[in-house]
Interface confidence: medium
């Protein structure tokens, strides 16, 4: 399987909400011993490998934001900790998973990474991630709503296996 990022750039005005999205592609083993660990974190564009550094999103680590379930099951983080920080991660039956950030400020600007780990028999088997940029803007040049820019065909299968 691999991870696609439908949009590589999100440009949003201050105060707006945004939902960053990744999509799980390819054959997904639905065996009872297979689960998927999905999460989000911030990173910086490292010279060697994008998304290699895992930094918190609004002080929440990738462990705080993770979803852990089988195949294309739906799930979401509804715990108070994430919601108090204006965050919610979710996953649907179609392989889409997302993080919603509310009330954006300039400090939310940066590189965001989604991570999917396939776990078999409690052992990590396969790990892929996708990356996207969030730019929060203010002033007369800021858009009135979030504007999203599709990934190029090469980027949309923004795959890095670990």
């Amino acid at each position: 399987f691999k991870v696609a990022t439908p949009y590589s750039l999100y440009v949003c005005p201050e105060g707006q909400n945004v939902t960053l999205t990744c999509r799980l592609l390819g054959p997904v083993d639905k065996g009872h011993d297979v689960t998927f660990y999905k999460t989000w974190y911030r990173s910086s564009r490292g010279e060697v490998q994008t998304c290699s550094e895992r930094r918190p999103i609004r002080n929440l680590t990738f462990q705080d934001l993770h979803l852990h379930h089988g195949g294309h099951q739906a799930a979401n983080t509804s715990h108070d900790l994430a919601q108090r920080h204006g965050l919610e991660s979710a996953s649907d039956h179609h392989g889409n998973f997302s993080i919603t950030m509310r009330n954006l400020t300039l400090l939310d600007s940066g590189l965001y990474c989604c991570l999917v780990v396939e776990i078999r028999h409690h052992h990590s088997e396969h790990r892929v991630h996708g990356a996207m940029e969030l730019q929060v803007q203010t002033g007369k040049d800021a858009p009135s709503n979030c504007v999203v820019y599709p990934s190029s065909s090469q980027d949309s299968e923004n795959i890095t296996a670990a």
Partner: antibody, heavy 113, light 111 residues
Framework: QSVEESGGRLVAPGTPLTLTCAVS????????MSWVRQAPGKGLEYIGV??????GPYYTSWAKGRFTISKTSTTVDLKITSPTTEDTATYFC?????????WGPGTPVTVSS | QVLTQTPSPVSAAVGGTVTINCHSS????????LSWFQQKPGQPPKLLIY???NLASGVPSRFKGSGSGTPFTLTIYDLECGDAATYYC????????????FGGGTEVVVQ
Amino acid sequence: QSVEESGGRLVAPGTPLTLTCAVSGFSLSSYDMSWVRQAPGKGLEYIGVIGTGSTGPYYTSWAKGRFTISKTSTTVDLKITSPTTEDTATYFCARGWVKLDLWGPGTPVTVSS
Amino acid sequence: QVLTQTPSPVSAAVGGTVTINCHSSQSVYNDNYLSWFQQKPGQPPKLLIYQASNLASGVPSRFKGSGSGTPFTLTIYDLECGDAATYYCAGGYNIGDSYSAFGGGTEVVVQ
């Protein structure tokens, strides 16, 4: 809308000091807040910022370990962990990160034995 | 990050034009996270320009900011006596952690 700093005073080197920034007319859940200082006759120095929710705090490299920024629902605190004479300055609290659009009058801190 | 302002000091006559430059050792975030401030003795700084070229609320249009990435320029047209002050640029960076830095300041003398 206003911000006002307090807590500045004369302290001995090594004695921790906490400055408080009280805000009114706007919510800290909607604005990032920064701390900036200015030594007598010198330029502005950026210390760090704390964001909405619990984004940050983030510190400039020289300030890491020397300062701690925290907040409540209506105040933002700056703790000078172990002041030295070089920390003598006026400390400003400002609304925003780069777009610092609302400043307090500043609170003076003198570090001397 | 290092923000270098030139020149300092700078002087011009009433009605004249002053240009201040701000050069960053590294591009600011989004190429436009740069602000300009005016500070007079005994007062806190006042925001003039944000995101490189946006005029802050209540600031006369005589003040103009320009530039992208680095360098940046603040131009003051039709200089008035009240414009005598020290001007600072401040850049925002999002490499590793988010942080900012100020330039060293430029004193503007109005003759």
